[in-house]
Amino acid sequence: ECGHISVSAPIVHLGDPITASCIIKQNCSHLDPEPQILWRLGAELQPGGRQQRLSDGTQESIITLPHLNHTQAFLSCALNWGNSLQILDQVELRAGYPPAIPHNLSCLMNLTTSSLICQWEPGPETHLPTSFTLKSFKSRGNCQTQGDSILDCVPKDGQSHCSIPRKHLLLYQNMGIWVQAENALGTSMSPQLCLDPMDVVKLEPPMLRTMDPSPEAAPPQAGCLQLSWEPWQPGLHINQKCELRHKPQRGEASWALVGPLPLEALQYELCGLLPATAYTLQIRCIRWPLPGHWSDWSPSLELRTTERAPT
């Protein structure tokens, strides 16, 4: 190798200057004794190289690029060799930003997968490989004192969420949780969450059904629907409140919300609807009065109200 480039830093803030040096060894005898070293950034020749012969006979060219405005580019030093440019060495330069503070960190406890799923917004593009790590620890109190650390959770490339498995969780005990972002230009940390996994529990919705008419019960009135639902069994012992929503199947009507439903009710007569009309209905629930997240809406139930009796 006849030439070698060294740079002040291969990764810099976007727009910052960068200085590079290219040294040509003396024993490259096939070269012109006073070769002119040229610089190229990408495809563009770069003027401004300062060239000198060093005491050991090697030639050195130093260039300062005042602003590196490319997020990625190759810088090369070269010589004119006949009618072509002979590249002696090249380096990859990268420019970008240090990671912004990850924000909007939130978590939910999924009792089906037995994991705490946390997500966040990574902030603006850094143009550099940036790693995110969900960090956490167990705490006896309000997260001021740190207990056992929990194994770092590293999301798959490009994802802004990570799941902490059950074996690293302790229910009914606070955890400190934060996201650390890191790249070649710096490290940032999100504000810390302090939470008990059960306080961010997300239940599965009940299964909504039409109530089986019993022989002794009066049929539903016009404009009414008799509904029942089967609670999600694994969440049966969690006190919760639920709400319904409904809309006519035809037309452009928006959802109408009914709730909260009477606590612990597993059936409900919904009235005030249009007679002889097909409706779509859904139900969802939340842990209550203790904190939690709303479940998703249940699969839709489609029912038709009875006709008004002729007058």
Epitope: S114, K167, M198, Q233, H237, E264, L266, P289
Partner: antibody, heavy 118, light 107 residues
């Protein structure tokens, strides 16, 4: 300190009735599911019934369905089990227990013995 | 109904031994598995809930693991006060069901 104290057990003839009570103290009784679990002499544990915090949901084991009724009085911090049409196989120590949100029993009362025999 | 099968039904061990008890559910129960200790003439006491969470006040030599259908209770170093009967219980769906129990006795 959470305490559960059962009472009402004793000797009863087959076909007879008995009402068990469980007095609770040391916690907000009205916020918790409660349950009854029994253990026949020398046997394992068997869940009998549970009741939701306001009493609206009351699942039962098939072996007692239609014969036993669980209820609660939140103003008295007391859980009940009304047992009718008792059979010899209902002989057991009956425990009342608080139910955790994910369905575990803790703490338990000391138990009351129900003997069904002629 | 979900059947719970505990094994072994009895085991003999010495103080300081590592003891493992297994519990198998007849269908998947996620992590809804609880472990209890019961001494003769006494009420059961909760050791582990939701498969691996140690109840307050229970020594750390007790641990639980597993998910789905296969679960394990481990006592890392058996102490004299640990000789008792151990029960598993599923709380995934009603009827809530218990295993048959494992009696840990002194060798």
């Amino acid at each position: 300190e959470v305490q559960l104290l059962e009472s009402g057990g004793g000797l009863v003839q087959p076909g007879g009735s008995l009402r068990l009570s469980c007095a609770a103290s040391g916690f907000t009784f009205s916020l918790y599911w409660m349950g009854w679990v029994r253990q026949a002499p020398g046997k394992g544990l068997e869940w009998v019934s549970s009741i939701s915090s306001s009493g609206g949901v009351t699942p039962y084991a098939d072996s007692v369905k239609g014969r036993f009724t669980i209820s609660r009085d939140n103003s008295k911090n007391t859980l009940y089990l009304q047992m009718n049409s008792l059979r010899a196989e209902d002989t057991a120590v009956y425990y009342c227990a608080m139910l955790g949100e994910l369905g575990w029993f803790d703490p338990w009362g000391q138990g009351t013995l129900v003997t069904v025999s002629s | 109904d979900i059947q719970m099968t505990q094994s072994p039904s009895a085991l003999s061990a010495s103080v300081g031994d590592r003891v493992t008890i297994t519990c198998r559910a007849s269908q998947g129960i996620s992590s809804y598995l609880n472990w209890y200790q019961q001494k003769p003439g006494k009420a059961p006491k909760l050791l582990i809930y939701y498969a691996s969470n140690l109840q307050n006040g229970i020594p750390s030599r007790f641990s639980g693991s597993g998910s789905g259908t296969d679960f394990t209770l481990t006592i890392s170093s058996l102490q004299p006060e640990d000789f008792a009967t151990y029960h598993c219980q599923q709380s995934y769906s009603t009827p809530l069901t218990f295993g048959g129990g494992t009696n840990v006795e002194i060798r």
